[in-house]
Every structure is written in C-alpha cells, then in structure tokens.
C-alpha cells in the first residue's frame, strides 16, 4: 500500500518529506514566501494529501503561484510609476506613488514608495497599506512676481498667475427686493476653503446687524484674470459661509470669514492655495513689503463717491495689484486716531501704506490677501485680508489701508477646515 | 401676481394678546424677507421688524422688542405676528410686506376697553 | 437710528403742474459695497396701502409711470412728478433701508 514518490511544486515543498509514503500517511503542500498553493483556480495557503488504501494519492500535486498584489489603489491629485519591467504587480514589485507636482505636495514628504508583499497587499514602510496624501502646495505661484509695480488705483496689471490664490467673490442677495448685488475678493486656502473678510460676506441692507448671507447667493470665480471673460475660470457655488463669531459691524474687528467651495477645485498653473501664516500674535514686522491684488476701483481720475453714485461698471477689467509697506502700529493708530470719526485699529489689524498715498487698495478689492514672501519656506503668505480705510479717497496722503491680521487667526481658520493644524504645517515651516 | 392676503380686523382688550397674520401668493415664500409695519394717525409709519421666512431669521427694531415675536409657517406661505399686552397705544393699522416692494391688505387692530 | 425728515408736509398744486419734494436723512445712505443709496418713495392713496414707486433712490418700480422720477445721493433725495394728474392725490413716503429702516413723515399731495 505504498504511494508514489511526491514531487514538491515548483517554489514550494511538502512536509514531512520522506523516502516512502504508506495508507494513512498525509503531506502538507506549502509554497514559498510570496507564492500561495493554487488549487483548482483557488488560492490558499497550504494544502494537505492524504495517502489512500488502494496506494494513490487523495488529490494531485498543486501548484504555486506568485502572490499578485494587482492594480495599485488611485490616488487622489497623484500619479504612479511603475519600477519592474512590464508594470509587474507581483510579489516583491514596486511602485513609486508621486503627487502631480508642482500643484502637491506628498505629506510628510514620504518617498511613496510601495513593495508589493507576500500578504498581496501594497505596503509602505511608514504607511504600511494606507496610501499616501497629496495635499495642495501653497504659496508658489506658476510665474514669478517682478519686483515694479505700482498701485491698483491706476496701476498694474496682473498677468494670469501671479495671484493663483485670488478669487472673485459674487455675492446676489435674493432675499431681498430688489436683489442686491456685490463682489469683493477672497483668498484660495485649499482645494476647497475660501479666506476672505467678513464684511463682503455680510447681509448689506441692514447695516447695524451681522447677519451672513445665504450660501446660496454666494459664487466664487477661481484663476480669473479678466472678468469679461470668465471662460477659463472655475465657478464654484458655497457649501458654508463662515463668518468670524465676533465679527464687530462697528469697528470692523475679527473681520475675517471663509467660504467652503461645493466641490474641490482643480489645481492648476492659474488656480493654486495662498499659505497660512504661523500663529504669530505681532503679525508683519513693520516696513515689510507685501502684495495685495484685486478688480477694485482703479480710475484714478474718480473720486470714490462719483464712481458709487454714477452708475458705471466700476471692476476693473483685469486683476490689478500693488506692493505696500507694512505701517507700524502706533503710527497707524495715530493716523486714524486724529480724524474725526470713530476709528479703531485693534490688535487683531495691521496697516499698509504709503504716507505720501498714491497707492492703495480700494472699493472692491476687500476681502483680498496682502501676501509676504516668507524667505525661510520660500513661499508666499497670507499675512492680511483688505478690510477698510478712510474716509478720505483711497491712496490719499497719510490714510493708511486696514488689514485683518490673519496671524491672529491661525487656528480658528485650522478649526473650520477640520483639518490639524499639524497636517499642514510643514508647508511653511520647512 | 405677488399678492399679501392680510386677516381681519381686531378688537382687543387692555393687556390681551393678538396674531396676525399674513399670506403670500405669487412667489416663493420662504426666500424674502417679510416686514411689518404700524400705521397710526399722527404718527406716520413705523417698521416693527422682519423676518426671513426659510430660516426664521428676524430682526427687530429695538422699540418693539418684546412687543412683537414673529413667525412663519412655509407650508401655509404664511407669516405671524403676535402683539403681546396690548395697550391702546398699540391700536393701529398693520402692514406687512414683501421686503421693500409689495405691502399687505393690513389689518386695523383696536384695543379699547 | 437715522432720522429722516420730509418736506413740505403738504402741498397743493394744479393738474398738469410739475412738483418736486425732498426727504433728507440724519446720515448718508450710501453702501459703498453694493453702491446703492437704499432709499425708496411710496405713494399711499386714501384708505389704500402703500405702493412702492422707486427704489435705491432713482429706479423707477415696473409699472410705474415715468412722470415720476427719484434722484439724489448720500442724505439728500427728491421724488419729482413732472405732469401731476387727478390720480396722484396722495401721501408720498420715503424710507430709509441702510440701517434698521425708517420712513419720513410723508408729504401729502392735493390736487387745486
């Protein structure tokens, strides 16, 4: 009652291995790591045979087959390359996730590099099976901004991306009647926030209360240059409308907002995140030089009061911007504090200017981001949001413009993003 | 048409409370303000409030507060206004309208004795 | 809250007659945002309610006729009817909506 001699798979073995097998005698098929005993097209670790009565074996051999890890998981805003020949997804291959750069960024500047195991499932190092995170680059624009530049009102053009944070806010207040209709700017966060001040996202027709307006009336316009033509941008409805809780109609204090996008944007050489300042309470050193962009007011030539009343188009056509020294605190204080008028410039803004005027942000434009070259990440940030200024002309003598300082606000924005303040860090303190 | 179908006049006594009522036809309801409005010989016109009847947002002139409490039912396009301790200063004429353009029928309310 | 004064509290004049009444408000009503003056007249006929004519103190409502007309910027406003017929024997309101709105004390309108 003797059974035939075995003959072990190719990458596998039998156990116990033995001269001569007998009735009742049973082996154990199993195959090397990395290989799984195939039998009958079913997968399984091992497989036991059994020596019969009449001397033959209860099952034949199986055979082993390579662990096959098959098509890598997508991943979002990135790409995968293949490192065996012929895009091999078996055991021991390896791929190389990347992230469509130079729009993102691989999170924790994991290498992204995956082996397929002999478990069959794609693994990381650090990762293990969870596939990386491509998070939006911030505050590098496709063009590179040149140092000249002179003032919105009357200024200079803004060639498509340099500003691929800078959205167009439309706001149409259908609640009342007859509508109301608005714009003012705002600042790409992510793929899907909007940074801007809270007073363009503010019901108009009341002017004591802070009532926000209906998500509804709100569309954000991304990667605009010319709003005649609005055939390249991306139109996007809001989710949320997020007004600061202590936003102060009065004096404008916490004038800062965000607007959650129905969808994630595309990103692109004209659509790509401003980044976040460190939650820094002094804000902007005094005299540095930011950048503020927008479709405000830039006749030069019209007081603001004939450009309200008349009933002209007032946007201009084509983004304008302006580079503006950042005014000490004390000195902009006593500006204000010297005109008649109830202003007051708190802690939570900073102002930028010149004190010979002739260049300055305007009607229009609030909401917008004064950026600062951040030279330790190499990246542009958010450092203010155009908020107010006044009475006189804007870019009249020794009338500074007003800015949310948005370092004060660091981790409320984190808050209603949802996202850890730790995840998205690295982007500006590398 | 916009069209604002106000209830019928109301005699009240000192220190009893009223709701009047207000409805819409003609346009969606729930996405416009309706205000309210008091009429009084002598005394001109005078805005009570408002208020927004999709998401019951109001907003109150601060001499009416805790006179006036407004309400909306969308299922029935309609909206409230309760006047509460009635004095006879409060015997007027009530308009509600259509954010700024179309005004109700209005409802007279008296408070005598 | 922002006053708002009319006048003359009333006037009389004869059919065919241009007339002209001012509203004035305690401060402007000029939203430099939306770039409206939110101030509106009503015309408010005898035992009816009012009708809203102009809004953001120069467009003219539809339906209303363009003998009427409304201008001014900032805290001074006025309603012109340029031919006056039998018809526009009225009250003539203005109301002020940049803040918790207010109405002016009207100005009432006879016909000779």
């Known amino acids: 009652n003797e059974c035939p001699e075995l003959q072990p798979p190719v990458h596998g073995k039998i156990e116990p291995s033995q001269a001569k097998y007998f009735f009742k005698d049973q082996v154990l098929v199993s195959c090397d790591t990395g290989y799984k005993v195939l039998k009958d097209n079913v997968e399984m670790d091992t497989f036991q045979i059994e020596c019969l009565k009449d001397g033959t074996w209860s099952n034949k051999i199986p055979t082993c087959k390579i662990v096959d890890c098959r098509a890598p998981g997508e991943l979002e805003h990135g790409l995968i390359t293949f490192s065996t020949r012929n895009n091999l997804t078996t055991y021991k291959s390896e791929i190389k996730y990347s992230c469509q750069e130079p729009y993102y960024k691989m999170l924790n500047n994991n290498t992204g590099i995956y082996t397929c195991s002999a478990q069959g499932v794609w693994m990381n190092k650090v990762l293990g099976r969870s596939l990386p995170t491509c998070l939006p680059e911030c505050g590098q624009p496709s063009r590179s901004l040149p140092s000249l530049v002179k003032r919105i009102i009357g200024g200079r053009n803004a060639e498509p991306g340099l500003f691929p944070w800078q959205a167009l806010i439309v706001v149409e207040d259908t609640s009342r009647v007859p509508n109301d209709k608005w714009f003012g700017s705002g600042a790409l966060l992510s793929a899907s926030w909007i940074l801007t001040a809270a007073h363009v996202l503010r019901s108009q027709r009341r002017d004591t209360t802070v009532i926000p307006v209906s998500k509804e009336h709100v569309t954000v316009y991304l990667g605009l240059h010319d709003v005649r033509d609005k055939s390249g941008a991306v139109n996007s409805s809001a989710a949320r409308v997020v007004l600061h809780p202590d936003f102060n109609i009065q004096n404008y204090n916490h004038d800062i907002a965000l607007v959650q996008l129905q969808e994630p944007v595309p990103l692109g050489p004209h659509v790509m995140p401003v980044c976040l300042p460190r939650l820094e309470p002094e804000g902007p050193a005094p005299h540095m030089l930011g950048l503020v962009a927008g479709w405000g007011i830039s006749n030069p030539n019209v007081t603001v009061d004939e450009i309200i009343s008349s009933g002209t188009r007032t946007l201009s056509d084509v983004l304008q911007y302006v580079k503006l020294p950042v005014v000490p605190h004390a000195e902009c204080k006593t500006s204000y504090e010297s005109r008649s008028g109830n202003y007051s410039v708190t802690e939570n803004m900073f102002c930028a200017g010149y004190y010979e005027g002739g260049k300055d942000t305007c009607l229009g434009d609030s909401g917008g981001a004064f950026v600062i070259f951040d030279d330790l990440s190499q990246r542009w940030v958010v450092q203010g949001l155009v908020s107010w200024g006044g009475p006189e002309e804007c870019g009249s003598k020794q009338v500074y413009g007003v800015y949310t300082k948005v370092s004060n606000y660091v981790d409320w924005v984190w808050e209603q993003m949802g996202l850890p303040q730790s995840v998205v860090e690295p982007q500006v303190e590398r | 048409q916009v069209q604002l179908k106000q209830s019928g006049a109301e005699l009240m006594k000192p220190g009893a409370s009223v709701k009047l009522s207000c409805k819409a036809t003609g346009y969606t309801f729930t996405g416009k303000w309706i205000e309210w409005v008091k009429q009084r010989p002598g005394h001109g016109l005078e805005w009570i409030g408002e208020i927004l009847p999709g998401t019951g947002s109001t907003n109150y002139n601060e001499k009416f507060k805790g006179k006036a409490t407004f309400t909306a039912d969308s299922s029935s396009n309609t909206a409230y206004m309760q006047l509460s301790s009635l004095t006879t200063e409060d015997s007027a004429m009530y308009y509600c309208?259509?954010?700024?353009?179309?005004w109700g029928t209005g409802t007279t309310v008296t408070v005598s004795s | 809250d922002i006053v708002m004064t009319q006048s003359p509290s009333s006037l009389a004049v004869s059919a065919g007659e241009k007339v002209t009444m001012s509203c004035k408000s305690s401060q402007s009503l000029l939203n430099s945002r939306t770039r409206k003056n939110y101030l509106a007249w009503y015309q408010q006929k005898p035992g009816q309610s009012p009708k809203l004519l102009i809004y953001w103190a120069s467009t003219r409502e539809s339906g209303v006729p363009d003998r009427f007309t409304g201008s001014g910027s900032g805290t001074d406003f006025t309603l012109t009817i340029s031919s006056v017929q039998a018809e526009d024997l009225a009250v003539y309101y203005c109301?002020?909506?940049?803040?918790?709105?207010?109405f002016g004390g009207g100005t009432k309108l006879e016909i000779k």
């Open positions: 309208l259509r954010s700024e353009d179309v």
């Open positions: 109301k002020q909506s940049y803040n918790i709105p207010t």
